[in-house]
């Protein structure tokens, strides 16, 4: 069972006395709706609150919005709907915040059918005031913010049109006419795709893909037989249609889309799809749906060009286009990234990868579990995580898995342990050195989340029943203590922190139901009483990442070096405090095979590190053969890594091969053979 | 099989310094933290401090702070203690002992491997 | 610092006796503990670590347990071997050992 109460545990003294005196309750004079919150800006404590109440009558809607702002972190909260001049507004299009700690928020507001456009609220002070601009066109998209520049603003129209405001909203103009989609790239550009003929839906496979760096002035056509575009880490990707038939392949630029190389990944048909699952400056994990309904695919990782791929993981869960999938980067570790592949029996099980999709293994069973009713083997089976699949299924899974980056090794999830994820009610498990080992947390589903970078985790059980009791850990969710908020318990609808887990504060949302009427209420509760003290020297201890064998002169080696930790001892009941920054120390190691990838037109044997040149090109590796760039295709077999650090060691170089020579093939016509694309 | 062997006995006038090493042979001397411990005549145990030979971390007990330096050279596997400002109650013998890991944490599952001991005497 | 409280500081037993040594934190510690056993003249040698976890080579008479402040080190049937000093350690603070406990033949 999960440690708890009943044990001897680190006990926090007199902590229900200072949780009390810092609790804050504020009922919202609002009948129940929706409600949405954001955080404006790092560390201000600013918070705006929307709620919405929808009355569908027989002709039309009749709804109301009301804006709350707080300034001390949800403690308490100010009605401000009159600075938006008690306006409706729309909930879908959310609250658009700017980047970093620009202090601009955009609200898109409900205007009545025959208007000419729609209209904003906009904030530059962190929501102490609006100003109202009526919009030249009606949104069909919330703003989106330049990265680099949280003045300029884009936005689509209703009718496909491109906007851009170069003043935070305050002037707009139309920059381009039939436009599908539209992104901001880095240095303020812009990269949208257009239709020629129809609609973006009947020239889907026929779109051109533009750009323009001087927010509309020129533009420049990218690429055409566009089908759509994606935007990863340096990388820039198109699904471009082959000539031939109704295939698509990915091209890849790393020069905003000056030039493009193919990819050399398989082309899928019209019912698959490619998504971008996770991407750094280093490199992409990119899946590529298997032909028919089956709801997997393979993920394959990129060199650092994004060309050359290899493949890291086969039958993975990933249902249609724009679906579901558990792939989940977890940020706590370096490397580690978590999925669900479908077995060949249909039953779904967690992967986990500790060295960017190189190897993928089951999850350790934690210590304290046994298996369940799924195991065939009793002693033998794995933890298996609950994530973005489970809950679409509507299994009784409250939240996917939680990592932060500042609280390091650090992962929670809901799992079930056998052998494969099971429909029976999950528990809540965690891992403190980045998923190598786990343990039982809590006993049934929770909603949690991660304070004081780490030094608190606080939970809430997943009840259908009203609640007025959370549970709060020191010790990275080794022993528990319960504290009741409320007398009168609330229907709770979610746990609100501020983003980057530094905050020790924790909104716990809820409404109470009456017989007439029904409110929404919150609760804030502050923990820097709990943690009396500042986290000194002497409450950190080293831990080596990814170590796995202390006898191994290279243990921790992941991706050329390793990395040794401060982190917090989980006896230490301190505070590491808002300016926390995670004490690092990498060391370079020594190069093996382990370092490289296989170049195009090299392979991995089983059970061997090194690379050996394919017999014969055929399918994807041929068309890449045949219509890749000239340079692509020279090669001494090995490429090292991504984002690798290793020095010295193993030195895999060899003779440089030409393997144009390699790239015919009976199938495809001579003139083919011939031309090169760039 | 892991050894730890200790430099010889030291005799020390008060207020000099002393220097032990501890040379590791037979494993992965940089994967483990070593530590130094010291048990004065008829006493208990008593940690003075410990280092990560990868990146040379230390770290002292509060006790010896400021009068103690702990080093490591991974070249040649060996750890150093240094103890400064000598007196007599510094008298005792010297450990260093290898902490044993499982995990990543280095200094969480007790000393596996000591050296024999190197005896410090502090007299005028 | 953290401290350890060893008890009894000393306890005579005889071959075949179950000796048990107890060992309280000041604060919790997990199970960040280690048991040792030293004799004259020699350096301590890891009998058990992660307060219940037996380090290999030594024997199963020996057996700790326990959690956050409360730890017991059992030797279930003395041996001649045994007569020594035992010492408690904790590791999740900065490294303190407990006072010690001799075991001497009654």
């Known amino acids: 069972s999960a440690p708890g109460e009943d044990e001897e545990c680190g006990r926090v003294r007199d902590f229900v006395a200072k949780l009390a005196n810092n609790t804050h309750q504020h009922v919202f004079d609002d009948l129940r709706g929706s409600v949405s919150l954001s955080w404006v800006g790092d560390s201000t404590g600013v918070i705006l609150v929307l709620t919405t109440f929808h009355v569908p009558l027989v002709i039309m809607t009749f709804g109301q919005s009301k804006l709350y702002r707080s300034e001390d972190y949800g403690k308490n909260f100010k009605d401000i709907t009159d600075l938006i001049n008690n306006t409706f507004i729309r909930t879908e299009f959310g609250m658009a915040i700017g980047p970093e700690n620009s202090g601009k928020v955009v609200l898109t507001a409900e205007v009545s059918g025959g208007s000419r456009g729609g209209r904003i609220f906009r904030s530059s002070d962190f929501a102490k005031n609006f100003v109202q601009t009526d919009l030249p066109f009606h949104p069909l998209t919330q703003m989106m913010y330049s990265p680099q520049n949280s003045d300029y603003l884009l936005a689509l129209s209703t009718e496909n049109g491109l906007w851009v405001s170069k003043n935070f909203g305050g002037k707009w103009e139309e920059i381009h006419k039939a436009v599908c989609l539209a992104k901001w790239g880095s240095d303020n550009t812009i990269f949208f795709t257009t239709y020629a003929n129809g609609s973006c839906k009947a020239d889907l496979g026929a779109l051109e893909l533009w750009r323009t760096s001087d927010l509309g002035k020129s533009f420049k056509t990218i690429g055409v037989k566009i089908y759509s575009f994606g935007l990863g880490g340096r990388f820039l990707f198109a699904s471009v249609m082959a000539d031939k038939d109704t295939t698509r392949r990915i091209h890849v630029s790393t020069d905003q889309g000056d030039t493009w190389s193919m990819a050399q990944l398989p082309s899928v048909g019209q019912e698959q799809f490619y998504s971008i699952l996770a991407a750094n400056d280093d490199m992409v994990f990119m899946h590529v749906d298997e032909p028919g309904d089956t709801g997997f695919g393979t993920i394959f990782t990129s060199d650092d060009r994004g060309i050359v791929y290899s493949k890291s993981l086969d039958r993975h869960l990933y249902t249609t286009t724009g679906g579901e999938t558990d792939f989940t980067n977890v940020t706590s570790l370096r490397g580690v990234y978590i999925t669900s592949v479908l077995s060949e029996d249909n039953s779904i099980q967690t992967m986990i990868t500790f060295d960017q999709g190189g190897r993928w293994t089951h999850l350790r069973k934690p210590e304290n579990s046994e298996c369940d009713a799924t195991a065939k083997n009793k002693n033998e089976c794995s933890l298996h995580i609950h994530a973005s699949y489970s809950i679409s299924q509507k299994l009784n899974v409250p939240m996917a898995p939680l990592s932060e980056p500042n609280a390091v090794g650090i992962v929670i999830a809901h799992g079930s342990v056998g052998d494969a994820i099971s429909v029976m009610v999950p528990d809540v498990y965690i891992s403190d050195d980045g998923g190598y080992s786990w343990t039982k947390m809590l006993e049934g589903p929770h909603y949690y989340t991660i304070l004081d970078s780490g030094g608190i985790i606080v939970a809430i059980e997943h009840s259908s029943r009203p609640i007025n009791v959370i549970k709060f850990s020191t010790d990275e969710g080794q022993c528990w203590q319960t504290y009741t908020f409320t007398r009168d318990p609330i229907y709770f609808t979610g746990l609100a922190s501020e983003p980057g887990a530094r905050s020790m504060n924790i909104s716990i949302w809820g409404f109470t139901e009456s017989f007439l009427t029904s409110q929404w209420v919150s609760y804030t509760i502050d923990f820097k009483d709990i943690l009396e003290r500042n986290c000194e020297e002497k409450d950190y201890t080293i831990w080596l990442a990814h170590s796995t064998d202390p006898e191994d002169y290279e243990d921790g080696c992941i991706a050329g070096y390793k990395e040794q930790f401060l982190r917090l001892r989980k006896s230490s009941v301190c505070q590491n405090g808002r300016d926390y920054v995670v004490t690092k120390q990498p060391s370079i190691c020594l190069c093996s095979l382990e370092d490289f990838l296989c170049d195009f037109g090299y392979y991995r044997p089983e059970n061997d590190s090194k690379c050996v040149e394919q017999p014969e090109l055929k399918g994807h590796d041929l068309e890449f053969c045949l219509y890749g760039r000239e340079e692509h295709l020279t090669t001494n077999g090995y490429r090292k890594i991504p984002g690798d650090k290793c020095q010295g060691g193993v030195n895999p170089v060899r003779e440089v091969k030409d393997l144009k020579k390699k790239c015919t093939s009976n199938f495809l016509s001579p003139e083919k053979q011939n031309s090169k694309s760039n | 099989q892991v050894q730890l062997v200790q430099s010889g006995a030291e005799v020390k006038k008060p207020g000099s310094s002393v220097k032990v090493s501890c040379k590791a042979s037979?494993?992965?001397?940089?994967?483990?933290?070593i530590s130094w411990v010291r048990q004065a005549p008829g006493q208990g145990l008593e940690w003075m401090g410990g280092?990560?030979?990868?990146?040379?971390?230390?770290n002292y007990a509060q006790k010896f702070q400021g009068r103690v330096t702990i080093t490591a050279d991974e070249s040649t596997s060996t750890a150093y203690m240094e103890l400064s400002s000598l007196r007599s109650e510094d008298t005792a013998v010297y450990y260093c002992a290898r902490q044993g890991r499982k995990t990543g944490y280095y200094y969480y599952y007790g000393m596996d491997v000591w050296g024999q001991g190197t005896t410090v005497t502090v007299s005028s | 610092d953290i401290q350890m409280t060893q008890s009894p500081s000393t306890l005579s037993a005889s071959v075949g006796d179950r000796v048990t040594i107890t060992c309280r934190a000041s604060q919790s510690i997990s199970s960040w503990l280690a048991w040792y056993q030293q004799k004259p003249g020699k350096a301590p040698k890891l009998l058990i670590y992660k307060a219940s976890s037996l380090e290999s080579g030594v024997p199963s008479r020996f057996s700790g347990s326990g959690s956050g402040t409360e730890f017991t080190l059992t030797i279930s049937s003395l041996q001649p071997d045994d007569f020594a000093t035992y010492y408690c350690?904790?590791?999740?603070?900065?490294?303190?050992f407990g006072g010690g406990t001799k075991v001497e033949i009654k």
């Open positions: 350690q904790q590791a999740d603070g900065h490294i303190t």
């Open positions: 280092i990560i030979p990868i990146g040379g971390w230390a």
């Open positions: 037979g494993g992965t001397f940089r994967n483990y933290a």
